[in-house]
């Protein structure tokens, strides 16, 4: 009798619990910006404040007949999604509605912020528990809903946003590309993109993670018992919505930061067909799909990281990328990847007080990624060491040299554009533990962190025969920190981190002409959280 | 993620014909006008105007009631539709394009975006 | 399996209070609805209210609101049906029924509890 | 409230031959987002509560033997017996569950002729 979206999402030993805060109550809010609701279906009922908050655009057409199931029918299923008492993921939850999208589901970007700043308003003069704002609607980019975003995430507020519905780079959309916002694209009952018509889900770095959107069995409008099924994006940012409702009623202290990365972390892995994004998408869309997390006091203080995608640089010279964490982590690695293999490396810098990762594009490249690798890292003191280049033929060699600091990442730079003269650097974990090596022309960044009980190790994979890439995981218990490919092939596309594994990709033309000898390498740094022990290095 | 991507940016540093006032002569523009890449989902005539982060509260009234005297003065009725204080300051204004080049030469301007559709998914 | 076991046959005065009881067994007792209907000797069925055990939330037929409460408790999965001051009108068979939400309707009931008010 | 009006009020049939029952709801009971008619017939036999036979209309609840079927739409409806048996010798009710408060019909008596 479980609709398999709610088995989807919600493990097993999830279903029949409650979530409430420490004292009893369920104190979470959670503000849905949509059309007007059906306020008195059985699902929500006593659950759901209606504000009187309406800013929507007339409806278009002189033959327009308001008809109030319709007028309420995105909206109530979305509410019942999120805190329906039969369907809802979160199903004690409180919710207010405000009415932003009209009677054919059009809505305006200022109509949206001034939704936004009513919620804002509402927090100052009533500061109640935590606020979740679920946005299931997309226009254009918009740099100003996106500011309106980020500014609310700032108060504490945790935003989830429709990836929207136009097959598309959810990047080029609104507020879905906004990155304090908690991104959500649509999967069905197979774990697959949703298709929707001719278009579906979108897709890309924007896209946090999956949820259930398709054939989502939910409260519909038409009458006080009457149920339906919906799909799309905004279906599936319900979902979300729920689940984040679901574990800040458990613990309200968890901050944005802390729920994306549980977020990520506890969701099922590697199940969506990639095949189905355009190929230059595929390894920027997430391989996500929701589920329930546990609480940390089930899980204990593990490390938790992600990766971050910068926009691509763009094919100019000189172009750079830039890939920012968000305020409350850290940076523990940067890596590049160019699908044409021209790039002259990454680098750590900071940018006012925050640590960015950067890449850089080489003559002649069709331009650059850069790839952060953010993670959570409680009362860390991180700090960037670096070389310049050496001399020719000579190694550069950077250690983390404080004491007590543990090397999480290296990024390697080269100075000259032209490929063929230099070599790749190279990590060399047996001879030199704890540090970043690099050859002729590269200036050398290694990323140091000290932090209670961090440890981390490197792990190495080589791969003398032809491969497009070579991967090495982080065991159980580790955390990948830092990505490399190291030297092998006369050309490398670089390397990047997908969830606990480490992926160095090789250009084809060099596959052809490696000799067995010139193994190309990919070099993880794992890292755990053991808060007893002492920071160190693992051999 | 928030990178300015398929989105249209133009410079609007018109120059100024601002009635010979010192203050408005003396200030070019160096604020942008944005706005949605999907012409279809533009609403032209509609306009948010977003001041910078430190510009205060007085400030932001101040600004909006200066646009309506400028337009004013050159025969345009302006309406202005909202105030923004709590997210950012700003304020949303019904007005003529004709009207963007002075509008981003007010002072505090950092950007204006014209207004468009958000649809539900 | 599951059911719905409702307590025994009452006997009463008019004016006295009556809590009579819909224990469920064997499904999530807090993620499906009880509902209550009368049944009066000879007569059809009535619909008199609904609780959501989860939340206890409650729905009433306009004619027993005011009549009758609904309540639950969820740590022992037992609704109930309760009268502060009977009359011989009340006189009725109750059933307690499970609704299935998605179809909403009575899929499971209990056995019935007939109550008798009479001096 | 949406009343809900049963014809006949008794109904007598031979064994084997068709029993069919009639229900009318004052307001129509199909809604279109998901095109179902929110209506359900249930069978009462003498001293046991009431079994559910159909929903959504016509669909059997599982278990129910095929000679019920139930039809209509929107404010009409039908439950059709197609061979009388001597167990279905029971009073029928249809109900409505689209809205709160929910209602029967004053209930159909099938006897056998």
């Known amino acids: 009798s479980i609709p398999w979206n709610l088995e989807r999402i919600i493990p097993a030993w999830h279903q029949t619990e409650e979530d409430r805060s420490p004292d009893g109550s369920s104190q979470v809010e959670v503000y849905l910006l949509d059309t007007s609701i059906q306020g008195a279906h059985r699902e929500i009922e006593g659950r759901v404040t209606i504000t009187d908050f309406n800013s929507v655009p007339e409806e278009d057409g002189t033959r327009f007949h308001r008809q109030a199931s319709k007028c309420d029918s995105h909206g109530t299923h979305l509410a019942g999604v999120v805190s329906g008492r039969d369907a809802g993921v979160a199903k004690g939850t409180s919710l207010h509605s405000l009415r932003v999208l009209n009677c054919q589901g059009k809505g305006t970007v200022s109509g949206t912020l001034i939704g936004l700043e009513f919620i804002r308003k509402s927090q100052l003069i009533q500061p109640s528990g935590p606020l979740v704002v679920l946005l299931p609607l997309a226009g254009g980019y918009s740099r100003i809903l996106n500011a309106a975003c980020r500014h609310l995430a700032r108060t504490g507020v945790v935003l989830v946003a429709a990836a929207g519905n136009f097959r598309d780079d959810a990047c080029l959309y609104s507020p879905a590309s906004a990155p304090e916002v908690i991104t959500v694209g649509a999967t069905n009952a197979q774990d697959q993109p949703v298709t929707l018509g001719t278009l579906g889900t979108n897709f890309g770095r924007c896209v946090d993670l999956f949820a259930p959107g398709k054939d989502i069995i939910g409260a519909s409008s038409d009458c006080s018992t009457c149920f339906m099924s919906q799909s799309g994006t905004s279906q599936a940012a319900a979902h979300v919505a729920g689940i984040v409702a679901r574990m800040l009623s458990r613990e309200p202290t968890l901050t944005l930061a802390e729920l994306r990365q549980r977020l990520i972390h506890f969701s099922t892995k590697d199940v969506i067909n990639m095949a189905w994004f355009p190929e230059d998408q595929q390894v920027l869309t997430p391989n996500l799909v929701a589920t329930l997390p546990p609480s940390t006091h089930e899980t204990g203080g593990q490390l938790l990281c992600r990766t971050v995608w910068s926009a691509h640089s763009g094919p100019t010279r000189t172009a750079t990328a830039t890939a920012r964490c968000a305020p409350e982590e850290e940076l523990l690695s940067c890596s590049s990847f160019s699908r044409s293999g021209r790039r002259r490396g990454d680098w750590i810098e900071a940018i006012g007080g925050q640590q960015v990762c950067k890449a850089l594009n080489a003559f002649g490249g069709e331009g650059v990624y850069a790839v952060a690798r953010c993670c959570l890292v409680p009362r860390a003191n991180c700090s960037i060491h670096n070389t310049p280049a050496a001399r020719a033929g000579l190694e550069t060699h950077v250690h983390c040299h404080q004491k007590d600091h543990v090397l999480t990442g290296c990024s390697f730079h080269w100075e000259v554009e032209d490929l063929s003269v230099r070599r790749q650097p190279a990590l060399r974990s047996r001879r030199q533990p704890g540090q970043c090596v690099g050859h002729q022309a590269a200036s050398v960044y290694a990323s140091c962190c000290h932090a209670p009980g961090l440890e981390c190790k490197i792990k190495e994979h080589g791969i003398s025969g032809p491969s497009e890439q070579v991967t090495v995981a982080c065991e159980a218990g580790w955390t990948l920190t830092g990505c490399n490919v190291l030297p092998g092939a006369s050309l490398t596309l670089g390397a990047y981190s997908v969830d606990n594994l480490c992926v160095a990709r090789v250009h084809d033309t060099a596959r052809a002409d490696r000799t067995s000898g010139e193994a190309t390498v990919a070099a993880a740094i794992c890292c755990r959280s053991r808060p007893s022990a002492k920071a160190s290095w693992v051999q | 993620q928030d990178e300015d991507g398929d989105y249209e940016e133009l410079m609007l540093a018109l120059p100024s014909q601002e009635d010979g006032l010192a203050d408005e002569a003396a200030h070019v523009a160096t604020a942008t006008f944005r706005r949605c890449s999907k012409e279809a989902w533009r609403l032209p005539g509609t306009y948010i105007v977003v001041l910078m982060e430190e510009t205060q509260r007085l400030q932001i009234e101040q600004t909006a009631h200066r646009l309506q005297t400028r337009a004013a003065r050159r025969g345009y009725v302006i309406k202005v539709l909202h105030i923004f204080y709590d997210l950012f300051p700003g304020f949303l204004v019904k007005m003529s394009s004709d009207l963007l080049g002075l509008a981003l030469k007010l002072p505090h301007v950092e950007y204006i975006e014209e207004d468009s559709f958000v649809f539900a998914q | 399996q599951v059911q719905l076991v409702q307590s025994g046959a009452e006997v009463k005065k008019p004016g006295e209070s009556l809590k009579i009881s819909c224990k469920g067994s064997?499904?999530?007792?807090?993620?499906?609805?009880i509902s209550w209907v009368r049944q009066m000797p000879g007569k059809g069925l009535e619909w008199m209210g609904i609780i959501y055990p989860g939340d206890s939330y409650t729905n009433y037929s306009p004619s027993f609101q005011g009549q009758v409460t609904i309540s639950a408790d969820k740590s022992i999965s037992t609704a109930y049906l309760q009268w502060s001051s009977l009359k011989a009108s009340d006189t009725a068979m109750y059933y307690c029924a499970r609704d299935y939400w998605y179809k909403p309707l009575f899929d499971i009931w209990g056995q019935g509890t007939l109550v008798t008010v009479s001096s | 409230d949406i009343v809900m009006t049963q014809s006949p009020d008794s109904l007598a049939v031979s064994l084997g031959e068709r029993a069919t029952i009639n229900c009318r709801s004052s307001q129509s009971v199909l809604y279109s987002s998901n095109n179902k008619n929110y209506l359900a017939w249930y069978q009462q036999k003498p001293g046991q509560p009431p079994k559910l036979l159909i929903y959504w209309a016509s669909t059997r609840e599982s278990g129910v033997p095929d000679r019920f079927s139930g039809s209509g739409s929107g404010t009409d409806f039908t439950l059709t017996i197609s061979s009388l048996q001597a167990e279905d010798v029971a009073v029928y009710y249809c109900?409505?569950?689209?809205?709160?408060?929910?209602?029967f019909g004053q209930g159909t008596k099938v006897e056998i002729k």
């Open positions: 109900q409505q569950y689209s809205s709160f408060p929910i209602t």
């Open positions: 064997g499904y999530s007792f807090t993620n499906y609805w």
